[in-house]
């Protein structure tokens, strides 16, 4: 959402979020690190191209032309400098002058040593319990953001991990149309469209950076869960990793796992949609998880096959009209899991990413809640690994990522909601090792061709 320094009456009224870096001569004297040439305060660039007609409520949602409903000036950083005040480096760079390349390795969770597994679990738990040092979340829409008295900004602190959950919730929430009116649900700024992969890529990158900074461990990396096993068991659902099944309630996590103590945020949908409030930092009930337990839907009781990944990587077009969840021959829609692994759209199909979520059969299978289950992180790092392999194979061909007429939030140059500072889909449509400072340690299955008899 927004830096704590910008959650003020003055910043919100002025529309300027350009915090100081080192204001030696007093407040406002080093906006965006301008005194050291790191950046400057400039007008926000927001995508104004048309979106598809399935969203008919222009002017009613704070997420439109993000982030202009809140701020119209932000820091534009020079060179490899980055961040809300140009005080950090772009992904893949480090050092005081952001001139040292860095490459971290994301590895299979199951391949980590016992120590590394334990370190990762403890780091996640620390992120759940550590207040985000930079960002605060809005608990009201823009028209109510200054509170009933017009002088009390409606923002809250939130933990690093819950911020990760909140940003996802905010991107998928319904459009509130007013008290007594039904909220509009045919909108999603991070799923069912071309931005699915780029949005989730930045989402992970932000969490990874936040955890690196929390630990002050620049080489910390998020591992992945290779969910394409074809099995009907969750191989990472053990107490030393993501938590086994509770013996007392098959939908809960074992009390021997730290994750059994986690409580979810953003679960009060009824309130958000009828009162127009936003999810806040209040924690609620436990994570629910019942892998392979949905007996009513046998198709989601088994994880994707290894060959499903090999097949989806042969779909050479990134996306295809209508750039939605019914696109056919679209790599994005295939890996997202609305098409079968060969790219053919079928409304009955749930494959790859979607199937992995639904297999978890609980918190992780509900879009507005899913990041509350930390398996979400591992599921999406694997999805991102598939995306990065596609980018490598097809030379990051962005030509079929639409500039306009995608679902709202999904145009190529749209600033991904609700990330700050503004970051476009294009910026994430690049090969990670060369451009974003991370790589995957992974072997891809080669497609097996069966000879017809």
């Amino acid at each position: 959402q927004f830096p704590r320094q910008c959650a003020t009456v003055e910043a919100l009224r002025s529309g300027m979020c350009c915090p100081d870096l080192s204001p030696v001569s007093g407040p406002g004297t080093d906006r965006c690190g301008s005194s050291s040439g790191r950046g400057r305060c400039e007008a926000v660039t927001a995508d104004s191209r048309p979106h598809s007609p399935q969203y008919p409520h222009d002017g009613r949602d704070d997420r439109e032309v993000w982030p202009l409903r809140f701020f119209n000036r932000t820091c534009h950083c020079n060179g490899n400098f980055s961040g809300h005040n140009c005080g950090t480096c772009r992904p893949g760079w480090r050092g005081a002058a952001c001139d040292q390349r860095v490459l971290i390795v994301r590895r299979n969770l199951l391949d980590l040593s016992k120590e590394e597994k334990n370190h990762f679990v403890r780091a996640l738990d620390m992120a759940k319990r550590t207040t985000h040092p930079l960002f605060v979340i809005a608990t009201r829409r823009s028209e109510e953001i200054l509170g009933p008295d017009g002088n009390t900004p409606q923002f809250e602190n939130i933990s690093i991990y819950n911020y990760f959950v909140w940003t996802h919730y905010y991107s998928v929430k319904k459009t509130f149309l007013g008290v007594g009116q039904e909220s509009f649900g045919e909108v999603d700024f991070s799923h069912e469209g071309p931005a699915f992969l780029t949005w989730h890529r930045y989402h992970l990158l932000r969490l990874e950076k936040d955890m690196q900074e929390m630990l002050q461990e620049p080489s910390f990396s998020l591992p992945y869960w290779n969910f394409a096993t074809g099995k009907n068991v969750c191989d990472i659902c053990t107490d030393d990793l993501m938590g086994s099944r509770s013996n007392f309630d098959s939908t809960l996590i074992s009390p021997n796992s730290v994750f059994s103590q986690w409580r979810v945020v953003c679960d009060s949908l009824e309130d958000y949609d009828t009162l127009g409030t936003l999810c806040n930092s209040t924690e609620d009930g436990p994570i629910r998880r019942n892998p392979a337990g949905n007996v009513a839907r046998p198709m989601v009781q088994r994880l994707p096959e290894p060959q499903d990944v090999a097949q989806c990587l042969e779909v050479g077009l990134f996306d295809t009209p209508p750039f939605y969840s019914n696109s056919t021959n679209s790599f994005r829609n295939t890996v997202e899991g609305y098409s079968d692994p060969t790219g053919k759209y079928d409304p009955a199909v749930r494959s790859l990413h979607n199937l992995a979520h639904l297999f978890l059969n609980g918190t992780g299978g509900q879009t507005h809640l899913s990041p509350n289950d930390p398996i979400f992180v591992l599921l999406h790092t694997f999805t991102d690994a598939v995306f990065d392999e596609w980018l490598r194979r097809y030379n990051a061909d962005i030509s079929t990522f639409p500039l306009e007429n995608a679902p709202i939030g999904h145009n190529r140059q749209y600033n991904m909601v609700p990330f700050w500072p503004p970051v476009t889909n294009t910026e994430m449509f690049v090969t990670a090792p060369d451009n974003l400072g991370y790589t995957y340690e992974i072997q891809w299955p080669s497609r097996e061709f069966s000879v017809p008899e």
């Epitope: 050092g95 005081a96 040593s113 120590e115 630990l215 002050q216 461990e217 620049p218 080489s219």
Partner: antibody, heavy 119, light 108 residues
Framework: QVQLVQSGSELKKPGASVKISCKAS????????MNWVRQAPGQGLECMGW????????TYAQGFTGRFVFSMDTSVSTAYLQISSLKAEDTAIYYC????????????WGQGTLVTVSS | EIVLTQSPATLSLSPGERATLSCRAS??????LAWYQQKPGQAPRLLIY???NRATGIPARFSGSGSGTDFTLTISSLEPEDFAVYYC??????????FGQGTKLEIK
């Protein structure tokens, strides 16, 4: 280039306190955690823990809780180690080392500060 | 907690000879092992990281090998300035560092 300059040797009586400093230069102090390592005379190296120089949050190794305090002053890019209720067995060289290039090893070290506790 | 055991405790060799120092971990540390050299009155100096990578400015006569639980530091041809104490190190849980007890390399 990265440099860590520690304060000079200290001679203290049992029960007293000591505060040693480690001034960093050549990098952004608040970007990298600072570790503290102890080496008793003729002995090996022992990790005492580290301080997050961004948040000030310290993490202590087993055996280094209670009398040992890590702190810092970001305005002068300096980390501090304070030891209270000194005992003879605290006699050692204390090193600071930032977690700079990687979290897996320590590639820059201060020159060390000898603390001698003797009556 | 992982324990690192170095052997031998003392190694007596002459300049020009080959030195082989061993470090054994009580359980696998993958390839996350480093070697340091410490001379009297000086701070430790990083020689090798990730089991086999030479740190900046370290001469080619120093090499590291091994993975899992068994690691070796080799000095192909000893120079007079190489006589010192050598420590192996791994990063234990929660960003703490564990060191071996050291091997003293002395002139024969």
């Amino acid at each position: 280039q990265v440099q860590l300059v520690q304060s000079g040797s200290e001679l203290k009586k049992p029960g007293a306190s000591v505060k040693i400093s480690c001034k960093a230069s050549g990098y952004t102090f608040t970007s990298y955690a600072m570790n503290w390592v102890r080496q008793a005379p003729g002995q090996g190296l022992e990790c005492m823990g580290w301080i997050n120089t961004n948040t000030g949050n310290p993490t202590y190794a087993q055996g280094f809780t209670g009398r040992f305090v890590f702190s810092m002053d970001t305005s002068v890019s300096t980390a501090y180690l304070q030891i209270s209720s000194l005992k003879a067995e605290d006699t050692a060289i204390y090193y600071c080392a930032p977690r700079y290039s990687s979290s897996w090893y320590l590639d820059y070290w201060g020159q060390g500060t000898l603390v001698t506790v003797s009556s | 907690e992982i324990v690192l055991t170095q052997s031998p405790a003392t190694l007596s060799l002459s300049p020009g000879e080959r030195a082989t120092l061993s470090c054994r971990a009580s359980q696998s540390v993958s390839s996350y092992l480093a070697w340091y050299q410490q001379k009297p009155g000086q701070a430790p100096r990083l020689l090798i990281y990730d089991a086999s990578n030479r740190a900046t400015g370290i001469p080619a006569r120093f090499s590291g090998s091994g993975s899992g639980t068994d690691f070796t530091l080799t000095i192909s041809s000893l120079e007079p300035e190489d006589f010192a104490v050598y420590y192996c190190q791994q990063r234990s849980n929660w960003l703490m560092y564990t060191f071996g007890q050291g091997t003293k390399l002395e002139i024969k």
